[in-house]
């Protein structure tokens, strides 16, 4: 088995990626500069720590979470890093152009990097549905389209619905999930005979996927609180997210055992269900008034996640061609919707309490925001899927799906790696 890219891709990928990188460097040269004010060095360090948490989540957390395939673990981790690095650069520019450009220059701050990392995280969530079926050249396209779509979605929601950074970024869960699922739907689905074993999980990669889940679990409170504008909101977000993910871990492990006829615990269920609470509280993490509510939400989210992991893969595998272990897409789509519904419930309770028609209008606005996020995710995902199907990208043949040897140089080329 040859470990080389096909010649055309070997020519196409470096040229495409390096040309793009050169273009990004030029854009940074002409249009960006650093924030000049650095009075408070202690504040700078604290601000950097939040960004660092997000980077750890993205690079290690999501990188390793998607690495459970028997023969595709190297590619999962490294391709994630590649997409993160590219996505952050493009997101910084895009956010700057969309929000600050009238002043002529994009001012880069640590907040810009924080925001860009969160935008790039969207791609890392989406790509779980297609990893193993695409090459790096295709992933570059996916990064560019998704970051652009998310940036524009956030800008539209911000301007039309008058929402702040946190509220419009928390659509990331449903956006990323539906984007990834719609891209997967466009890609060739059937796995030819003899390749079924490649999309199975193996012990060592599954352990690294669990490591990824642990990193995500530890840093999810940072993600949910990163864009809140006051200390009290951040404190509440951190606490509520922590309680929710703590309960979802207990629920995931016990629920997984409950779902198995012999009471065994499924690695795949646990990998994603431990994060369920964090996704479900995302939108309203700063609003939940007491720990027990966050814990109940974590419990419900954990049960939904385990239930989804048990019953949805069959459907997703048939319809979307998503392997059983890539459950992040439908997991996040369900849990993201749950989170949005919780927020809408809080709005409805406000309406009942206030007897104010204008708050009823808020409910409609929130439903409008959610609908817009889903529609843009599906449309841009389908567009991306169609683009990825173009012959120019020299996509891996179905027989080479989920195979590190297509992309990586292994000196020993060990059989059954």
């Amino acid at each position: 088995m040859s470990s080389k890219y096909p010649r055309s891709v070997r020519r196409c990928l470096p040229l495409w990626a390096l040309t793009l990188e050169a273009a990004l460097i030029l854009l940074f040269y002409f249009f960006t500069h650093y924030d000049a004010s650095l009075e408070d060095q202690k504040g700078l360090v604290a601000s950097y720590q939040v960004g660092q948490d997000l980077t750890v989540m993205a690079a290690i957390g999501l990188g390793f979470l998607t690495s459970s395939f028997r023969r595709h673990s190297w590619s999962s981790v490294a391709f994630n890093l590649f997409m993160l690095a590219l996505g952050v650069q493009w997101a910084i520019l895009l956010d700057g152009f969309l929000s600050q450009f009238p002043s002529g220059k994009v001012v880069i701050t640590l907040f810009s990097i924080r925001l860009a990392t969160m935008s790039a995280l969207s791609v890392l969530i989406s790509v779980d549905a297609v990893l193993g079926k695409v090459n790096l050249a295709q992933l570059v396209v996916m990064v560019l389209v998704e970051v652009t779509a998310l940036g524009n979605l956030r800008m539209v929601i911000s301007n039309i619905f008058n929402t702040d950074y946190h509220m419009n970024m928390m659509h990331i869960y449903v956006f990323a999930a539906y984007f990834g699922l719609s891209v997967a739907w466009c890609l060739p689905k059937p796995l030819p005979e003899g390749t079924e074993d490649k999309d199975q999980t193996a012990t060592i990669p599954s352990l690294s996927a669990m490591l990824g889940a642990l990193f995500l679990w530890m840093f999810w409170p940072s993600f949910n609180s990163a864009l809140l504008r006051s200390p009290i909101e951040r404190k509440n977000a951190v606490f509520n997210t922590y309680y929710a993910v703590a309960v979802s871990v207990v629920t995931a492990i016990s629920g997984s055992s409950l779902a198995h006829p012999q009471g065994k615990i499924s690695k795949t269920y646990v990998h994603s269900a431990v994060l369920a609470g964090g996704v479900a509280v995302g939108t309203s993490c700063h609003l939940i008034p007491s720990p027990w509510l966050a814990m109940v939400l974590g419990l419900v989210a954990g049960l939904i996640s385990v239930g989804g992991a048990k019953y949805l893969p069959g459907c997703c595998n048939r319809v979307l061609g998503i392997p059983h272990s890539s459950i992040m897409g439908y997991n996040f789509s369900l849990l993201g919707l749950l989170g949005e519904i919780i927020y809408i419930v809080l709005l409805v309770l406000d309406t009942v309490g206030a007897g104010n028609g204008m708050i009823g209008f808020q409910v409609l606005l929130s439903i409008g925001e959610l609908s817009l996020a889903i529609v843009i995710a599906l449309m841009s995902g389908l567009l991306t899927g169609l683009l990825l199907n173009l012959k120019i990208w020299k996509a891996p043949h179905e027989a080479k799906y989920f195979d590190d040897q297509v992309f990586w140089k292994f000196p020993h080329l060990a059989v059954g790696f």
Partner: antibody, heavy 126, light 108 residues
């Protein structure tokens, strides 16, 4: 009593720079987002800039973007406004104000400016 | 965003008056966190109302805020001579803020 005290105003020529300071007393600056607001002679209030409590994010009114920079030193309990390339239309009394957030509904925090300084006058004239 | 307020209003002592604030971007909702300020000549502005209808501890009971017909509104009931001042609304626009042009309230 909680107070904000602005300083650094004065007369300056067009194109020059000036740095305003706003010192907080009887409260910890770190716990609050902070605003700069100005009022030209005989005119209404105009919001100028806002900085998050930890200094990580900043917003500016379109007419001052690229010329003004808001910053803070929480260890000194002080807020700053660096004004470059000053124009005649920047002549105004500059106020700093603190932003509070309060949860008065299940689904929303409300943001508002509760404490204002007495203002410092900036005159841009040749 | 352009915020429109009545440039001036006149009211008799003991009367009731409503000041409004409209946004060029459409209906004002609680998402805009409407704030109202009072400013007397030579003084710094003083906060009166936040979140459309919430009063500060120092705000007199005769002041009340609301949302009326897609506008933020400030109602003064039982107006006192000392209420003669300039009144400004402030709205939140996705992170940034904008003031209205102000309403000069005269108590005659």
């Amino acid at each position: 009593e909680v107070q904000l005290l602005e300083s650094g105003g004065g007369v300056v020529q067009p194109g020059r720079s000036l740095r305003l300071s706003c010192e907080a007393s009887k409260f910890t600056l770190y716990n609050y987002g902070m605003h700069w607001v100005r009022q030209a002679p005989g005119k209404g209030l105009e919001w100028v800039a806002f900085i998050w409590f930890d200094g990580s994010n900043k917003y500016y009114e379109d007419s001052v973007k690229g010329r003004f920079t808001v910053s803070r030193d929480n260890s000194k309990n002080t807020l700053y406004l660096q004004m470059n390339s000053l124009r005649a239309e920047d002549t105004a009394v500059y106020y700093c104000a603190r932003e509070l957030s309060k949860k008065v509904a299940l689904s929303r925090y409300y943001y508002y400016m509760d404490v204002w300084g007495q203002g410092t006058t900036v005159t841009v004239s040749s | 965003a352009e915020l429109t307020q009545e440039p001036s209003l006149t009211v008799s002592p003991g009367g009731t008056v409503t000041l409004t604030c409209a946004s060029s971007t459409g209906a004002v909702t609680s998402r805009y966190f409407p704030n109202w300020f009072q400013q007397k000549p030579g003084q710094a502005p003083r906060a009166l109302i936040y979140g459309s209808n919430n009063k500060h501890s120092w705000t007199p009971a005769r002041f009340s805020g609301s949302l009326l017909g897609g506008k933020a509104a400030l109602t003064l009931s039982g107006v006192q001579p000392e209420d003669e001042a300039e009144y400004y609304c402030l709205l939140f626009y996705a992170g940034a803020w904008a003031f209205g042009g102000g309403t000069k309230l005269t108590v005659l």
